[in-house]
């Protein structure tokens, strides 16, 4: 039975050209994470990080991604193009699945908040 | 052209220890991890553990953590991994391979590993 | 970890056939599938990535579909050398392979 839930940063903004955190977070479970996965708008692997053998971050975003902090993502040098929804799958055992969702969106205006509230999706 | 070129077979006895070198060439070497897996007869490929040559950082797989170790030379880009208290069920063909992102895209050819008293 | 089993386990083909190899995971692998060939003595080699994508130099003749539990590699027209054992590889949860299917000449 699946009794956890994905806390994430809900709908946040960042400014093009900066930097933004990607933050789910597992609670009220004590199943084992065994790898969480960060998929982009399309659905497109980001990054892993796997429990035993570490992140790993796929080649075209290498310069732009940064693990962490903990199971987060950063996301750096931000372009409109990253605008859009961010996916963290959270895989344990042996609860099974758990999916948090992201919207970003990315301002051009100077005065763009960041804001970094958690909210249950 | 990418290439991982692996040392030859190898026949030890049980409680020895083994190291298998991995000379990489056609790329930056310290531009993606490598890892090392193997195959025993009639088993599956299975991973033993990674390194980035980067910094030297290692990660193991839980079954191989206190017997396996991953080093590099960069200078030579070189990776070895020794594996100590052999015995016979680690008879096996052991590969390196570099990741690119999330898959292995180049292999080592292999190294025999015949453990038997 | 997600566990993969490929069917068949050997499977005899002539020349020119058609042929198609199964993989299926224990759980949801979502695409991120994975296929290699490996010849006797030889390193494995990369054919398909993320399910379909056909990695560069790979004759066309290869393909890989799937979705869900279920992915599967099809050769179009056997060629002598592609016999060889295929293994499926998956990335989702776990990084794992399938055991393997051992194509023989018929």
């Known amino acids: 039975m699946m009794t956890g839930t994905i806390e994430t940063t809900g709908n946040i903004s960042a400014k093009k050209g900066g930097s933004v955190i990607l933050q789910c977070h597992l609670s009220s479970t004590m199943a084992q994470v065994t790898q969480v996965n960060w998929e982009q708008h399309d659905h497109s692997l980001l990054a892993i990080r796997n429990a035993e053998l570490g992140w790993h971050i796929y080649p075209a975003f290498k310069d732009r991604v940064a693990p962490g902090p903990g199971l987060g993502l950063t996301l750096q040098s931000l372009t409109m193009n990253d605008t859009g929804e961010y996916f963290c799958t959270y895989h344990t055992y042996p609860d099974g699945t758990y999916r948090g969702r992201i919207f970003l969106e990315v301002l051009e205006s100077s005065v763009a908040e960041h804001s970094a509230r958690f909210q249950i999706p | 052209e990418v290439q991982l070129v692996q040392s030859g077979a190898e026949v030890k006895k049980p409680g020895a220890s083994v190291k298998v070198s991995c000379k990489a060439s056609?790329?930056?070497?310290?531009?993606?991890?490598i890892y090392w897996l193997r195959q025993a007869p009639g088993q599956r490929l299975e991973i033993i553990g990674r390194?980035?040559?980067?910094?030297?950082?290692?990660y193991f797989v839980d079954k191989f953590k206190n017997r396996a170790t991953l080093t590099t030379d960069t200078s030579a880009s070189t990776a070895y991994m020794e594996l100590s208290s052999l015995r016979s069920e680690d008879t096996a063909v052991y590969f390196c391979?570099?990741?690119?992102?999330?898959?292995?895209?180049?292999w080592g050819q292999g190294t025999l590993v015949t453990v038997s008293s | 970890d997600i566990q993969l089993t490929q069917s068949p386990s050997f499977l005899s083909a002539s020349v020119g056939d058609r042929v198609t190899i199964t993989c299926k995971g224990s759980?949801?692998?979502?695409?991120?599938l994975v296929w290699y060939q490996q010849k006797p003595g030889k390193a494995p080699k990369l054919l398909i990535y993320?399910?379909?994508n056909l990695q560069s130099g790979i004759p066309s003749r290869f393909s890989g579909s799937g979705s869900g539990t279920e992915y599967t590699l099809t050769i179009s027209s056997l060629q002598p050398e592609d016999f060889a054992t295929y293994y499926c590889?998956?990335?989702?949860?776990?990084?794992?392979f399938g055991q393997g299917t051992k194509v023989e000449i018929k």
């Open positions: 391979a570099r990741i690119d992102g999330f898959y292995f895209d180049f």
């Open positions: 056609g790329y930056t070497f310290t531009e993606h991890s």
């Open positions: 993320s399910t379909d």
């Open positions: 390194i980035d040559p980067k910094n030297g950082r290692t």
């Open positions: 759980q949801n692998v979502n695409k991120y």
């Open positions: 590889y998956q990335y989702n949860n776990g990084f794992t």
